[in-house]
């Protein structure tokens, strides 16, 4: 009865900031409403990063200032956070919620473990 | 720091109806489902209801289905439970409860009594 | 609606034994959604453990969980005066949310 959840053990965030994964859940049963959440882990403390609402097959909307941006097809969601810092290095657990039709399910994924490196700033040049 | 109190309990007959309080403080209330679970005197713990963020999605036990209605209001920070139709088993505390980021209820209210008996 | 049974109902201690409770599954939790509360006379439940295995904020390590599928165990290494209370297991995984009726830990 459980609902499994997966996602990516590692993935590296690019120059920019910006790290990108999929989560991908099994449904137990036929929802129309999923919430999906980003958590982060730091020793053993959990905070929300970002979360959203979707009707199936409707896209995938976070508020505008988050910092996540997501599309959503069947049981998957492609999950994208951006500005992120060398500071923000951490697991990243994706939570999903069949909010509706009952019964309620929830399914939390073994989390992501994104890398981010800062840019070196660019050496002073002579033209 | 998190706090949950409860309000709104008391003895009232049977058939007739009660609502019940939840004053939410010390996180932003909007971002966490709640829970309302009750304890009979002398007894375990019964969930009644769950209610998703922004309201819109509720869940009931068998128990009290048709009679409860919960609802939140998150501009006011606070947890409500309309009790109708209220019968003698109902007699309990009411307890309201945060849902943590993984899914427990790791905050709970103090719990308010009601006593329902002619 | 998945049910709880907990054993044993009421278990007599000293202080400084060890405290073994069980919660049994009517059928398959996933170990990420099942939790413990202590609770006292008078007093709203507390959460202990959560995720089966993860003790909650502020709790001792002589509190531990285990288990995984169908059976599930609370253990309290060394009972201290303060841990004589009832415990209740849940599941969160799915409504209805259920709870296990209790394991009473009491003074021998």
């Known amino acids: 009865k459980a609902m499994h959840v997966a996602q990516p053990a590692v993935v590296l965030a690019n120059s920019r900031g910006t790290a990108s994964f999929v989560c991908e859940y099994a449904s137990p049963g036929k929802a129309t409403e999923v919430r999906v959440t980003v958590l982060r882990q730091a020793d053993s403390q959990v905070t929300e990063v970002c979360a959203a609402t979707y009707m199936m097959g409707n896209e995938l909307t976070f508020l505008d200032d988050s910092i996540c941006t997501g599309t959503s097809s069947g049981n998957q969601v492609n999950l994208t956070i951006q500005g992120l810092r060398a500071m923000d290095t951490g697991l990243y657990i994706c939570k999903v919620e069949l909010m509706y039709p009952p019964p309620y399910y929830m399914g939390i994924g073994n989390g992501t473990q994104i890398y981010v490196i800062d840019p070196e700033p660019c050496p002073d040049s002579d033209f | 720091q998190v706090q949950l109190v409860e309000s709104g309990g008391g003895v009232v007959q049977p058939g007739r109806s009660l609502r019940l309080s939840c004053a939410a403080s010390?996180?932003?209330?909007?971002?966490?489902?709640m829970h309302w679970v009750r304890q009979a005197p002398g007894k375990g713990l019964e969930w009644v209801t769950f209610i998703s963020y922004d309201g819109s999605n509720k869940h009931y036990a068998d128990s009290v289905k048709g009679r409860f209605t919960v609802s939140r209001d998150n501009s006011k920070n606070t947890l409500y439970l309309q009790m109708n139709s209220l019968r003698a088993e109902d007699t309990a505390i009411y307890y309201c409860?945060?849902?943590?980021?993984?899914?427990?209820?790791?905050?709970w209210g103090q719990g308010t009594l009601v006593t329902v008996s002619s | 609606e998945i049910v709880l049974t907990q054993s044993p109902g009421t278990l007599s201690l000293s202080p400084g034994e060890r405290a073994t409770l069980s919660c049994r599954a009517s059928?398959?939790?996933?170990?990420?959604?099942l939790a413990w509360y202590q609770q006292k006379p008078g007093q709203a439940p507390r959460l202990l453990i959560y995720?089966?295995?993860s003790r909650a904020t502020g709790i001792p390590d002589r509190f531990s969980g285990s288990g995984s599928g169908t059976d599930f165990t609370l253990t309290i290494s060394r009972l201290e005066p303060e841990d004589f209370a009832v415990y209740y297991c849940q599941q969160y995984g799915s409504s209805p949310w259920t709870f296990g009726q209790g394991t009473k830990v009491e003074i021998k």
């Open positions: 409860a945060r849902t943590g980021w993984l899914g427990p209820f790791d905050y």
């Open positions: 059928q398959s939790v996933s170990s990420s959604f």
């Open positions: 010390g996180f932003t209330f909007s971002s966490y489902t």
């Open positions: 995720g089966a295995s």
